[in-house]
């Protein structure tokens, strides 16, 4: 007896497609060995049409594919434009045709449900539109039309032109009777429900001379498209509902148990919880598409997504809709990181974000999630050396360690900076991870002075503690500029006397600008590493002054404020809003961010649409 | 969720046929997999057959301890889901339980853990 199972029998209609899954027993041996779907020969062979290993026959060229899920010990065969001459007898197995492993299909495609002569199928997807065209002679012109749909064996009026509409048609169908020149009627059924399939009859007059034609509407529940992604890693669901419901709310949704379909995001604002962070609704084109993004892929993420349209933002019945069934795979290529890190107030974080190691040209962005309206990220660094102007001297993106990890520093922490950020590149759009930075309780661990001011021509020291908890780190100086920071000489000048409880191990390391000039003006940053990891950094502004009295400065840290006042952005400060940069290339498969500069406030393109790993901040 | 309903089991002598029918209460019927598993005394459920149907395509699925005698079929109009079961023998004395799967149907169907609904059961008792 085979382990392989799967349907036994597939019916289906000429030109509709089907979906045949296999499931096997998920044994490593198994889900790698090569997976096939062959049509029984009348002597017994079985001649391949389509397998895992990319070979596909020339009888399915452009209309089938076959796709493995090894998590789920499961594959699933697609076949589109089905014709007649695809009814027989097939196998879908493991391995080799000869070898037994494989189960029997049954397949037969039929013309039609039972057609009667002079039928016009019609073939709609579920909550699309529908236009029956019923002809007529002259004689039944000023006669009434109607439209009956059968029943069981009684044909049940549905509507009619003296102005009947069936209940379950109410508030979506309507009867138009063409011009004068036209002998036609039609009746335009919409949001079809499964419910709405059968055979209909379309009549002009009621007495033995009136015109008949019959119709048979066949509706379909969309197949959902099969997508599997990798665990950390992002979707992107594409909808596409058609132009009629450009001006309709559109939704997002999981399904949940029975007919109950979760909204996961809609265009009114709602969004689920478990998505906060995680997810944007790109703005819909003037064809009524849109696309939600997901980042951060969980286990529990898992599971069929329908995307509709609707005024209330929720699946209804008769809503025209797209499916996917995402699965998310364990065995992902997307490494573990942080999905918290957190700072105190005044301090720093190191946050660390992984890409796609054969894309290391690839550009390096972070950008800000913000939950208004579908959800937007707009940019504040990139690794070509732009920075948004309110965290100039504050942020900063390096290359390092390289090697599929970027690292992002964010200094001078208030709690405004509290919130989702997302790591991303222009290259592949699977890679896109989300970190939230939480502000907690605490005192920075390094110390500076505040603001400095140094005398052009003089000498300046700055100081900077490091308490004994890094005294294992590389401790460094830096000057700060949007390409990155750039390491200064620094002196150690021996233990620190600015932490109570602390030995010998803690350090004051000084940084030291002799004969300054205007260009030494600027951001310094001192801080800790281990290697290429980077921990805690600390922030000071060096302004550059004429000389007022001779001498050097030496700057201590009773000048220094203990925490730096949190910065409230002034009134000035402008979001970038959906309307101003729109660039539908930063979902799914953009290759480059667009270079867009506003050049009032710096800003850059954004991201945009109308039980965690936790890392503390102090260290990697 | 939809209510189910079994009827039409009883007694049969071996060789002889049954129908079971199992009707369904819900709008949306048309889109739910059907199933029928059965349970023997002191034994655990077992998958006998499902079907599901996706506005133009059927999929029928069914036990190997069952294929070519038992048949599963689906009348959406109705809102029912039969299981003709023919050349009975003893072994197939149990009491025959329908289930419903909503959508989607990509859940394995021999797996219960995928129906959300269950009828009462009908007791089918083949006398040898």
């Known amino acids: 007896k085979s382990p392989i199972f799967g349907p036994e029998e597939v019916n289906s209609v000429e030109g509709n497609s089907v979906s045949i899954t296999c499931y096997y027993p998920p044994t490593s041996v198994n889900r790698h060995t090569r997976k096939y779907w062959c049509r029984q020969g009348a002597r017994g062979g079985c001649i391949t049409l389509i397998s895992s290993e990319g070979y596909v026959s020339s009888k399915y060229a452009g209309r089938a594919n076959l796709t493995n899920f090894p998590e789920n010990g499961t594959f699933v065969v697609n076949i589109a434009q089905l014709s007649q001459d695809d009814s027989g007898r097939y196998k879908c197995g493991l391995g080799i045709n000869s070898r037994g492993l494989s189960f029997d299909v049954s397949l037969e495609v039929s013309q039609g449900p039972g057609l009667l002569n002079d039928t016009k199928v019609y073939t709609v997807d579920l909550g699309r539109t529908v236009t029956i065209n019923c002809p007529f002679k002259t004689e039944n012109a000023q006669k009434r039309k109607s439209l009956y749909k059968q029943i069981g064996l009684y044909p049940v009026l549905v509507i009619d032109s003296s102005g009947y509409v069936n209940p379950n048609y109410t508030g979506r169908i309507r009867l138009d009777i063409q011009g004068t020149g036209q002998l036609l009627f039609s009746v335009v059924i919409n949001q079809l429900r499964l419910s709405d399939a059968g055979q209909y009859l379309c009549q002009a007059g009621d007495d033995s001379n009136s015109n008949k034609k019959n119709a048979d509407l066949q509706v379909l529940k969309p197949e959902p498209e099969l997508v599997y992604e990798d665990l950390r890693g992002s979707v992107t669901f594409h909808c596409a509902l058609g132009p009629e419901v450009a001006n309709v709310a559109k939704f997002l949704c999981r399904q949940s148990s029975g007919e109950n379909c979760d909204v996961v995001v809609n265009t009114l604002g709602k969004r689920a919880p478990a998505f906060e962070g995680r997810i944007l609704l790109n703005p819909q084109d003037k064809d009524g598409s849109f696309s939600v993004v997901i980042t951060g892929l969980r286990k529990e993420d898992a599971g069929r997504y329908l995307c509709g349209a609707h005024s209330d933002g929720q699946l209804q019945e008769g809503s025209p809709i797209q499916a996917w069934q995402l699965f998310v795979n364990e065995e992902s290529t997307i490494p573990r990181s942080p999905t918290v890190v957190k700072g105190v107030a005044g301090g720093s974080v190191a946050v660390l974000c992984p890409y796609n190691r054969k894309e290391s040209k690839s550009i390096k962005y972070w950008c800000l999630w913000e939950g208004a309206q579908n959800g937007r990220c707009p940019l504040l660094v990139d690794s070509e050396g732009w920075v948004k102007a309110q965290y100039e001297g504050r942020l900063s993106l390096l290359e390092e360690p390289g090697n599929g990890t970027f690292t992002v520093i964010l200094n001078q922490l208030t709690s405004r900076d509290a919130g989702f950020y997302w790591c991303l590149t222009n290259g592949d759009t699977l890679w896109r991870t989300t970190v939230e930075i939480k502000i907690i309780e605490g005192e920075p661990n390094l110390k500076v002075p505040g603001n400095v001011t140094a005398v052009l021509g003089e000498t300046l020291k700055v100081p900077c503690h490091f308490p004994c908890k890094f005294s294992s780190y590389e401790k460094y100086w830096c000057k700060w500029n949007n390409t990155g920071c750039q390491a200064l000489p620094s002196q150690d000048e021996g233990p620190s006397k600015a932490f109570v409880n602390c030995d010998e191990n803690s350090r004051l390391v000084s940084l030291t600008l002799n004969l300054v000039t205007r260009a030494d003006e600027g951001w310094y940053w001192c801080g800790v590493k281990q290697g290429h990891f980077y921990g805690e950094t600390a922030a000071v502004y060096v302004a550059v002054e004429e000389r007022k009295a001779a001498g050097s400065r030496d700057v201590s840290l009773a000048k220094a404020d203990a925490a730096p006042d949190e910065k409230v952005l002034d009134s000035g400060f402008r979001e970038i809003e959906n309307k101003a940069i729109q660039d539908p290339r930063l979902f799914a498969e953009e290759k480059a961010v667009a270079d867009t500069r506003d050049q009032a406030d710096g800003s850059r393109a954004s991201v945009d649409s109308g039980s965690s790993e936790e890392q503390g901040g102090s260290s990697r | 969720q939809v209510q189910l309903v079994e009827s039409g089991g009883g007694l049969v002598q071996a060789g002889g046929s049954l129908r079971l029918s199992c009707a369904a209460s819900?709008?949306?019927?048309?889109?739910?997999?059907m199933g029928w598993f059965r349970q023997a005394p002191g034994k655990e459920r077992e998958f006998v057959a499902a079907i599901h149907w996706n506005g133009a395509s059927t999929y029928r699925y069914s036990a190997d301890s069952v294929k070519g005698r038992f048949t599963i079929s689906r009348d959406n109009a109705k809102n029912t889901v039969y299981l003709q079961m023919n050349s009975l023998k003893p072994e197939d004395t149990a009491a025959y339980y329908c289930?419903?799967?909503?959508?989607?149907?990509?859940?394995?169907?021999?797996?219960?853990?995928?129906?959300?609904?269950w009828g009462q059961g009908t007791l089918v008792t083949v006398s040898s």
């Open positions: 289930a419903a799967s909503p959508p989607p149907t990509v859940g394995d169907v021999r797996d219960p853990a995928n129906y959300d609904s």
């Open positions: 819900g709008r949306t019927f048309s889109s739910y997999a």
